[in-house]
């Protein structure tokens, strides 16, 4: 079987301040088993934006119904965007374990923030 791919179709997204940003991500398989996480930035200083497995992320909602057993769409919506949210967002698949280990990352989506229309 083909190895799982993480697909972020949008290289960039531009959103007006105060609006919501939708960041798209799909995977091509449910295997290997493990959660999806979203990060802003790359490397050891990256910021966790959403963790499917646990945590409280009040500004983030999943776009599709993540409780479907066959769900492979892990797109998210981030509300009330501000200029501080600008950056590149990565959708990352983890393989389950103790601890979970990073398996594959999407190519990233660059979020830019436009001034709020007056």
């Amino acid at each position: 079987e083909e190895e799982l791919q993480v697909i972020q179709p949008d290289k960039s997204v531009s959103v007006a301040a105060g609006e919501s940003a939708i960041l798209h991500c799909t995977v091509t398989s449910l295997i290997p088993v493990g959660p999806i996480q979203w990060f802003r930035g790359a490397g050891p200083a990256r910021e966790l934006i959403y963790n499917q497995k646990e945590g409280h992320f009040p500004r983030v909602t999943t776009v599709s119904e993540s409780t479907k057993r066959e769900n492979m769409d892990f797109s998210i919506s981030i509300s009330n965007i501000t200029p501080a949210d600008a950056g590149t967002y990565y959708c990352v698949k983890f393989r389950k374990g103790s601890p979970d280990t990073e398996f594959k990352s999407g190519a990233g989506t660059e979020l830019s923030v436009r001034a709020k229309p007056s």
Epitope: L30, I31, P32, V33, P35, Q52, K53, E54, E65, S66, T67, K68, R69, E70, K96, S98
Partner: antibody, heavy 118, light 106 residues
Framework: DVQLVESGGAVVRPGETLRLSCTAS????????MSWVRQAPGKGLEWVSG????????YYADSVKGRSTISRDNSKNTLYLRMSSLTAEDTAVYYC???????????WGLGTLVTVSS | ALTQPASVSANPGETVKITCSGG?????YGWYQQKSPGSAPVTLI????KRPSDIPSRFSGSASGSTATLTITGVQVEDEAVYYC???????????FGAGTTLTVL
């Protein structure tokens, strides 16, 4: 505190139909997938059916497929299981359970007893 | 189907391990305690190793490959119960349970 309270269990005759209910409180019901699990007298646990958070997607064990329907009313915080063509093999305590992000169970109701007897 | 031992026994204070196999690598595992037949199960562990906040720390879970293990460190008399392992398989979308392990505290 999370609470799940089942009702609707009864003594019924073979071939009859029954609808079980599970009323949820203490959490945002509409955000969670739910399942029904049963336990026949002297036996172990058996998963019966599951449903996604919105109710759009349903899943069934082979033992009940085609004669059971799981549904939910998120405005009433209530989960349902309608079972038809009941047989003695359906005699069991039926539990509703809240699903975790990966479709295991974290909270259970106290159960309701269904007895199928002529 | 998931396979677990029918029974285990231990003295108070000892460590007990209950294994569960057969789920494959596409599964997550949970552990459920039932103190009497027909009483509500209690979730001890889900997602292989996640313990709900109200469960005593003497209960822990782990998984390696297609085998999950429930460990009770310093078993107590009140831990006498039937312990079920449960699994969710991402290839079949189905939940399964083991037949249950009866723990007797001597």
């Amino acid at each position: 505190d999370v609470q799940l309270v089942e009702s609707g269990g009864a003594v019924v005759r073979p071939g009859e139909t029954l609808r079980l209910s599970c009323t949820a409180s203490g959490f945002t019901f509409s955000s969670y997938a739910m399942s029904w699990v049963r336990q026949a007298p002297g036996k172990g646990l058996e998963w019966v059916s599951g449903i996604s958070a919105s109710g759009s997607d349903t899943y069934y064990a082979d033992s009940v497929k085609g004669r059971s329907t799981i549904s939910r009313d998120n405005s009433k915080n209530t989960l349902y299981l309608r079972m038809s063509s009941l047989t003695a093999e359906d005699t069991a305590v039926y539990y509703c359970a809240r699903e975790t992000w990966n479709h295991l169970f974290d909270y259970w109701g106290l159960g309701t007893l269904v007895t199928v007897s002529s | 189907a998931l396979t677990q031992p029918a029974s285990v026994s231990a003295n108070p204070g000892e460590t007990v391990k209950i294994t569960c196999s057969g789920g494959g690598t596409s599964s997550y595992y949970g552990w459920y305690q039932q103190k009497s037949p027909g009483s509500a199960p209690v979730t001890l562990i889900h997602s292989d190793d996640k313990r709900p906040s109200d469960i005593p720390s003497r209960f822990s879970g782990s998984a390696s490959g297609s085998t999950a293990t429930l460990t009770i460190t310093g078993v107590q008399v009140e831990d006498e119960a039937v312990y079920y392992c449960g699994g969710y398989d991402y290839t079949t979308y189905v939940n399964t349970f083991g037949a249950g392990t009866t723990l007797t505290v001597l």
